[in-house]
Amino acid sequence: DSSKWVFEHPETLYAWEGACVWIPCTYRALDGDLESFILFHNPEYNKNTSKFDGTRLYESTKDGKVPSEQKRVQFLGDKNKNCTLSIHPVHLNDSGQLGLRMESKTEKWMERIHLNVSERPFPPHIQLPPEIQESQEVTLTCLLNFSCYGYPIQLQWLLEGVPMRQAAVTSTSLTIKSVFTRSELKFSPQWSHHGKIVTCQLQDADGKFLSNDTVQLNVKHTPKLEIKVTPSDAIVREGDSVTMTCEVSSSNPEYTTVSWLKDGTSLKKQNTFTLNLREVTKDQSGKYCCQVSNDVGPGRSEEVFLQVQYAPEPSTVQILHSPAVEGSQVEFLCMSLANPLPTNYTWYHNGKEMQGRTEEKVHIPKILPWHAGTYSCVAENILGTGQRGPGAELDVQYPPKKVTTVIQNPMPIREGDTVTLSCNYNSSNPSVTRYEWKPHGAWEEPSLGVLKIQNVGWDNTTIACAACNSWCSWASPVALNVQYAPRDVRVRKIKPLSEIHSGNSVSLQCDFSSSHPKEVQFFWEKNGRLLGKESQLNFDSISPEDAGSYSCWVNNSIGQTASKAWTLEVLYAPRRLRVSMSPGDQVMEGKSATLTCESDANPPVSHYTWFDWNNQSLPYHSQKLRLEPVKVQHSGAYWCQGTNSVGKGRSPLSTLTVYYSPETIGRR
């Protein structure tokens, strides 16, 4: 059942005498493995024997034996899929039909493959695109219907017999679908390649020529032109004549139209290959070319630069840059149309010739205000001298000059005064538009350039102003020299360093931070009473009576300043102790008597001790000693002692008399 056999392979294979042939082949025998394979050359079916007759090129049997003469032909397949064959070398008489006789356990099949072997290597085939245009990349393809693993070949490209520089890409195919060798060359033809011969050469592995194919390139291109001019240097003077001729060196396809262009613009009514210019003017100077068109497009000749020479035209001056900043650099450029270019220039500043300036450009490296003014020039060439143009104005800008800060007030200035200052300057370009003042303050500017400081501060030392246009120029600071009363007056205790005790030597100093003028007087005051006029107040031996609130005053010609009140505290042991008795020093028995220990002390008494007439201390430690009820035996002299952190003090004796009551006297 033939439907069970499926084969795939190229229909025809090509080779030449002495080469080889490789036949890629696949098959499928669905009913089992291949048991027998015979390769026939031109097989013919014999109906009598029901077998194929013909030359057996290859035979494989169940026992696997292969006749020795079959080495030229190799079956590279297997028992179920691959039926690839190789014949090496292949001979001319191998041409014809190859028959693959396949037998499996139950089925048989004859598959036919055509083999075309030529006497000599056959040529490859060059394939070109339908149209080739100059500078457009094309791919040239060289195809050979041959490839065999045992016989390496190469394809080489030649242009007019010379190997082409471009790299070709060679590919081979040995598949069941196709067998070929292909070379592809990417190439950008130029117009000069038109009509040239391209060859694809087949070579063996050693580079030996086998065969080739050639084609002639048909490169479509715009017309290629040459321009000729009389006179040949294209330099003329006004009034001369000029002839230009256009020649076509190549065109594919043929040209159709001719035109002439000047500076890229078409000249009207000039459609012949010759351009005649009579009595030229300077306006006709420029770049000329001819343009010829064909179906591909227009082609242009090289440009001819026609120079019509003339004397310089009236000149103009260009300034880089105006306005110019003082100190910057400025360049003046004399611009005058002339041919040939001017060789000499004369420069003028405010109408006066500038000596030694003969160049097209004048460079001033450091501009000063006096450089301002009108600049003009005259240009000269071999044909004559031009006229002086209108000139250009140089404006030199600079910051305000000689700025000064001026105090308008009579001197000296006192703290609290209103001070008026003005900001003056000598010259400025552009004009002064604003003023600045240093330091900044909440001050008024009643008019431009005038500063009014109301209630001037003691510490307003210096003021500087700036006059500003595009830049600010600062004046040197001016000293206000504000006079003021002494500041930050304070009382300083110089000695002792610790607490003041009664009897200490005490020095107080009147100190202050600053005064202007510096000449000062001092005054000391206690509780509104003047004490002295020195900077220091000294107590050789301080007493409690010296305690109190002290102030010092410092005077100068502007005014006087007082310190904060300073409290002088004197510490002393209890003094002026005395015992006072209530209701009196004579008390009737049975009543109540209160003895009080009165004293003067700083700090206050912290501890009291009571003593009787025998100097016996009593068990009482408060300021008051209360006797209730008082007895006649309480009569006697009492004294007290007070103690504080500084020391002790004692009172004199005070006598308490307790007399009998009428009842007691009545009982006696």
Epitope: R487, D488, R492, Q509, S513, S549, K564, W566, T567
Partner: antibody
Framework: QVQLVQSGAEVKKPGASVKVSCKAS????????MHWVRQAPGQGLEWMGI????????SYAQKFQGRVTMTRDTSTSTVYMELSSLRSEDTAVYYC????????????WGQGTLVTVS | EIVLTQSPLSLPVTPGEPASISCRSS???????????LDWYLQKPGQSPQLLIF???NRAPGVPDRFSGSGSGTDFTLNISRVEAEDVGVYYC?????????FGQGTKVEIK
């Protein structure tokens, strides 16, 4: 010994007022000027003002003018600092400090009072 | 008001090594009698400031003699001859010449 003891920490809302006290002991209260200094978290020291406990006269830093009031009570040897219209940037430790009568230096400082405004 | 500028703002120190802090005033703190009304304070972590030096160069009672103050007019220096671990904290200068009293920004001294 000489010491200044301040009132405890306070938490206030923005716009409220706070009154911090500073009680002096161990010296004659009326003989020394008292200053107030504050310190915001992680910041330096900032002087607020001075009071003379003897007469009650005051001087305030320009920044706090109109918001701060310093008073004293001689009977209890205490000075007070009241700050009104509180804002979050018033969060700080507030210190009272005694001025040495000889040098003008702050020789004794209170332990500080933390005022938090949030 | 008088502006005081301290430098450096941070000072890493090695125990036993000397250290110094500068304080510059926007105007002279020298008085008529020649006193420089500049004081130095130390604020240890979590504590109130404490007086170290008063009137430019006088050590406050109880302050170790490794601390000293110098300078006059507008430039003042606090010197620590040999830094000890307990000296860490923020050091402030303050002018006591006039009201308002003003302080420097503070210099943080820490052990390396």
């Amino acid at each position: 010994q000489v010491q200044l003891v301040q009132s405890g920490a306070e938490v206030k809302k923005p716009g409220a007022s706070v009154k911090v006290s500073c009680k002096a002991s161990g010296y004659t209260f009326t003989s020394y000027y008292m200053h107030w200094v504050r310190q915001a978290p992680g910041q330096g020291l900032e002087w607020m003002g001075i009071i003379n406990p003897s007469g009650g006269s005051t001087s305030y830093a320009q920044k706090f003018q109109g918001r701060v009031t310093m008073t004293r009570d001689t009977s209890t040897s205490t000075v007070y600092m009241e700050l009104s219209s509180l804002r979050s940037e018033d969060t700080a430790v507030y210190y009272c400090a005694r001025e040495d009568s000889g040098s003008g230096a702050f020789d004794i400082w209170g332990q500080g009072t933390l005022v938090t405004v949030s | 008001e008088i502006v005081l500028t301290q430098s450096p703002l941070s000072l890493p120190v090695t125990p036993g090594e000397p250290a110094s802090i500068s304080c510059r005033s926007s105007r002279s703190l020298l008085s008529y009698h020649g006193y420089n009304y500049l004081d130095w304070y130390l604020q240890k972590p979590g504590q109130s400031p404490q007086l170290l030096i008063f009137v430019g160069s006088n050590r406050a009672p109880g302050v170790p003699d490794r601390f000293s103050g110098s300078g006059s007019g507008t430039d003042f220096t606090l010197n620590i001859s040999r830094v000890e671990a307990e000296d860490v904290g923020v050091y402030y200068c303050m002018q006591s010449l006039q009201t308002p009293r003003t302080f420097g920004q503070g210099t943080k001294v820490e052990i390396k």
